[in-house]
């Protein structure tokens, strides 16, 4: 049955302390001109967290629910794309439907393709369940071919 993050513990039976985080991926530190001139590739990623329920707290970045889920997701991506080339993520949005997560990933150009972004994310599903108690499904990845304004960043590797 779906649970909310109020009952979600980052690590079952353990004590967790989180000190976030890292600088956001914003238009002030990354150019928004076309990929060929920036050397940056962007990918749009969407997935469902089927064991959480969406509520209005996920529309408010100041709530504990929003911040904890954003932090866990940001932390996950550090581990998933740890082999290099990962520049960060931005534009995290939460939508209804259990919880639908939408975000944009940035990589150094030429270091990864859509297929590998999706494959590596799917390989992390078990760890997401074990470490963060997040049941992930319905993963979708696509290229972001045009420049966009990278706002409301959730973190770039430090």
């Amino acid at each position: 049955t779906p649970t909310t993050l109020a009952s979600h513990s980052t690590k079952t039976d353990a004590s967790s302390t989180h000190h976030s985080s890292v600088p956001p991926l914003t238009s002030s530190n990354h150019s928004t001109s076309p990929q060929l001139s920036t050397g940056v590739s962007f990918f749009f990623l969407s997935f469902h967290i089927s064991n959480l329920q969406f509520n209005s707290s996920l529309e408010d970045p100041s709530t504990d629910y929003y911040q904890e889920l954003q932090r866990d997701i940001s932390e996950m991506f550090l581990q998933i794309y740890k082999q290099g080339g990962f520049l960060g993520l931005s534009n995290i949005k939460f939508r209804p439907g259990s919880v639908v997560v939408q975000l944009t990933l940035a990589f150094r150009e030429g270091t990864i393709n859509v297929h590998d972004v999706e494959t590596q994310f799917n390989q992390y599903k078990t760890e997401a369940a074990s470490r963060y108690n997040l049941t992930i499904s319905d993963v979708s990845v696509s290229d972001v071919p045009f420049p966009f304004s990278a706002q409301s960043g959730a973190g770039v590797p430090g």
Epitope: A14, K125, S130, R131, P157
Partner: antibody
């Protein structure tokens, strides 16, 4: 080559403080959890806690919560395990290990022997 | 916490013999087809070394005589033909639920 190099053996008196270290190289230190594992003389392995250096997130085994502090300095790729007041029962070998979600604790430090005796 | 029970505590065998070590978890450590159980070898005065991850995957550099099997709560480490350097203590470990836990170890000694 992935390596975890731990600081040298320590001999301390009860009540003293101590901080031991684990320096990583050959991998992106910030993005891997670093685990600390205790092995008391003649005994098995016990997981103490962990840190993700890139964010500073820590998790502790309840058994060790409040007894030790885990920290890291990502600028020098080093994780730490510290005690504010040692007890004789803290005498043990302490290992750090790298955690990879595909294979758990895949690389280990050589261990730091801590002896606490009056 | 998940308790891992290894058996036997000690296994006395001769070089060339087959060793079968067991690890039983107090609850399932399986998720979506993946077994979150791993095996380590520790020799006296040395750090543990990962042998098997995900119940059956042999870590790079580990000889083919080591194999792992099992799912759910019951897991086995098999050494098909013991070499002199295989006499050591073996630990299973789960990373399905924190705290990560280890079994108490099985000592494989020379008969």
């Amino acid at each position: 080559e992935v390596q975890l190099v731990q600081s040298g053996a320590e001999v301390k008196k009860p009540g003293e403080s101590l901080k031991i270290s684990c320096k990583g190289s050959g991998f992106t230190f910030n993005y891997f959890w670093i685990e600390w594992v205790r092995q008391m003389p003649g005994k098995g392995l016990e997981w103490m806690g962990e840190i993700l250096p890139g964010t500073g997130s820590t998790n502790y085994n309840e058994k060790f919560k409040g007894q030790v502090t885990i920290s890291a300095d990502k600028s020098i790729s080093t994780a730490y395990l510290q005690w504010s007041s040692l007890k004789a029962s803290d005498t043990a070998m302490y290992y750090c290990a790298r955690y990879d979600y595909t294979s758990s604790m895949d690389y280990w430090g050589q261990g730091t022997l801590v002896t606490v005796s009056s | 916490e998940i308790v891992l029970t290894q058996s036997p505590a000690t296994l006395s065998l001769s070089p060339g013999e087959r060793a079968t070590l067991s690890c039983r978890a107090s609850e399932s450590v399986q998720y979506s087809g993946t077994s979150l159980m791993h095996w380590y070898q520790q020799k006296p005065g040395q750090a543990p070394r990962l042998l098997i991850y995900g119940a059956s995957n042999v870590e790079t550099g580990i000889p083919a005589r080591f194999s792992g099997s099992g799912s759910g709560t019951d897991f086995t480490l098999t050494i098909s033909s013991l070499e002199p350097e295989d006499f050591a203590v073996y630990y299973c470990q789960q990373n399905w639920k924190v705290p990560w836990t280890f079994g108490q170890g099985t000592k494989v000694e020379i008969k």
